[in-house]
Amino acid sequence: PEPPTACREKQYLINSQCCSLCQPGQKLVSDCTEFTETECLPCGESEFLDTWNRETHCHQHKYCDPNLGLRVQQKGTSETDTICTCEEGWHCTSEACESCVLHRSCSPGFGVKQIATGVSDTICEPCPVGFFSNVSSAFEKCHPWTSCETKDLVVQQAGTNKTDVVCGPQDRLRA
C-alpha cells in the first residue's frame, strides 16, 4: 500500500514516531524521539532475547538442573535460549523439557518398537505370533521363535509371546 498504513516491519509506534525495534540479542534502553534514535544494549551473560523487540529486560537462559536429570544439549547465546536434554536412560516429560523420567521398559511379551531418545519414551509392541520376549527391557526387540526344523529337531513345547519353543529330538521309535 502507498503511502504506508503502519510502521515498517521492524518498527513500533511510540509518541507519533515509528521507532526501530531492538535486534535479537539486545534490549531496549530508550525509545527513539524526534531528536534521538532507539537505544539498545546487548543482553548480559546468561541472558537472551530471540526476536526483534522493545523489551526492557532480557530473559534468563534456562537452567538445566542435574537434580531433575537434565543436562545442556546446546548452550544459549544472546539470541537463543539454552536447550536442555536428559541424561542417558532418561527422557523429557514435556516439549519444554523441564524434567526427566526414566525410560520405560517393555514387559515380557512385549518388545521395543522404538528405542527411547532424550525427548521421547520407549515405544513397546506386543510380540506377534512366532515371536517372544522373556525379559523386561528398554532395548530388546521381540525375538523369533527358534526354528526346530532347521536343527533337525521337533517342537516339544509350543512357544508363547513370553517363551521360546522347546525343541527336542525326533522320536525314532515308530509303532
Epitope: 502507498e2 498504513t5 515498517r8 516491519e9 507519533s16 514516531q17 515509528c18 535486534q23 534514535e37
Partner: antibody, heavy 125, light 107 residues
Framework: QVQLVQSGAEVKKPGASVKVSCKAS????????MYWVRQAPGQGLEWMGW????????TYAQKFQGRVTMTRDTSISTAYMELSRLRSDDTAVYYC??????????????????WGQGTLVTVSS | DIQLTQSPSFLSASVGDRVTITCRAS??????LAWYQQKPGKAPKLLIY???TLQSGVPSRFSGSGSGTEFTLTISSLQPEDFATYYC?????????FGQGTKVEIK
C-alpha cells in the same frame, strides 16, 4: 549520530555498470527502509526506489525497472545501488536516504530524514 | 505519475524578507508532502514533513501549510544561511516525485 557514507565518484563508459554503496551507522540498519534518489547536473531530484534492509526486498521506480538493482549487506550495514547499461543521461549525483515515518491524525507520513553525501557518476565515452 | 509544480522557480530576496514558495500537485495528495533545502554541492536536508510538521533542529522561521493539491513553504524572516534551493516531494503515490525546485537568491 546517524551517518550515511557513500562510495567515491565514478567515471564509466556508456553500456557499463556502476555500483554505489551507502554505509549506515548510528542506528539499527535493518529497522529503516533505504531509498535512492539521483540528481542530474543542474537538475532536480529523481526518486529511484527503495530497499527493505531487513528482508532485502526492493521496489523500483518504473523508469529504472530492468536496469537498477538494489541490494544490502546487513552484516556491514551497507546498502547498494547498481545501475547497468549506462547512458550519458545517467550522469548524476546519486544519493541514499533513510526513511522516517511520522504518525499523526490517523495517518503514517514518510519522509527522508538522513541523506548520504552523494556519489557523482559520470558516464562518458 | 503525480506532477509537482513549484512557483516561483527563482526568487530574489533580502535578509529579513518574508518568503513564500508554492507547490501544486496534479492530483490530491492529502498531507503527504515534504519540503527539503539543498545547498550547492550538498545533499538535501529535511525541513518539513506531513505538510506542516517541522523537522527537529530546523529553525522555527520555517513553516509549512496546505493540504490536497496546494502547499506553501514560508520563511518568516530570511537569514543569510537560507539562500538555497527548496524542493517539495509528494509521498502519496509511487513514484514519490519531487518538484522542479525553487532557487532563493540574494537580491
Amino acid at each position: 549520530q546517524v551517518q550515511l557514507v557513500q562510495s567515491g565518484a565514478e567515471v564509466k563508459k556508456p553500456g557499463a555498470s556502476v555500483k554505489v554503496s551507502c554505509k549506515a551507522s548510528g542506528y539499527t540498519f535493518a529497522g529503516y527502509y533505504m531509498y535512492w534518489v539521483r540528481q542530474a547536473p543542474g537538475q532536480g531530484l529523481e526518486w529511484m526506489g527503495w530497499i527493505n534492509p531487513d528482508s532485502g526486498a526492493p521496489t523500483y521506480a518504473q523508469k529504472f525497472q530492468g536496469r537498477v538493482t538494489m541490494t544490502r549487506d546487513t552484516s556491514i550495514s551497507t546498502a547498494y545501488m547498481e545501475l547497468s547499461r549506462l547512458r550519458s543521461d545517467d550522469t548524476a549525483v546519486y544519493y541514499c536516504a533513510r526513511e522516517k515515518i511520522y504518525y499523526g491524525s490517523g495517518n503514517y507520513y514518510p519522509s527522508f530524514d538522513y541523506w548520504g553525501q552523494g556519489t557523482l557518476v559520470t558516464v562518458s565515452s | 505519475d503525480i506532477q509537482l509544480t513549484q512557483s516561483p522557480s527563482f526568487l530574489s530576496a533580502s535578509v529579513g524578507d518574508r518568503v513564500t514558495i508554492t507547490c501544486r500537485a496534479s492530483q490530491g495528495i492529502s498531507s503527504y508532502l515534504a519540503w527539503y533545502q539543498q545547498k550547492p554541492g550538498k545533499a538535501p536536508k529535511l525541513l518539513i514533513y506531513a505538510a506542516s510538521t517541522l523537522q527537529s533542529g530546523v529553525p522555527s522561521r520555517f513553516s509549512g501549510s496546505g493540504s490536497g493539491t496546494e502547499f506553501t513553504l514560508t520563511i518568516s524572516s530570511l537569514q543569510p544561511e537560507d539562500f538555497a534551493t527548496y524542493y517539495c516531494q509528494q509521498l502519496a503515490s509511487y513514484p514519490w516525485t519531487f518538484g522542479q525546485g525553487t532557487k532563493v537568491e540574494i537580491k
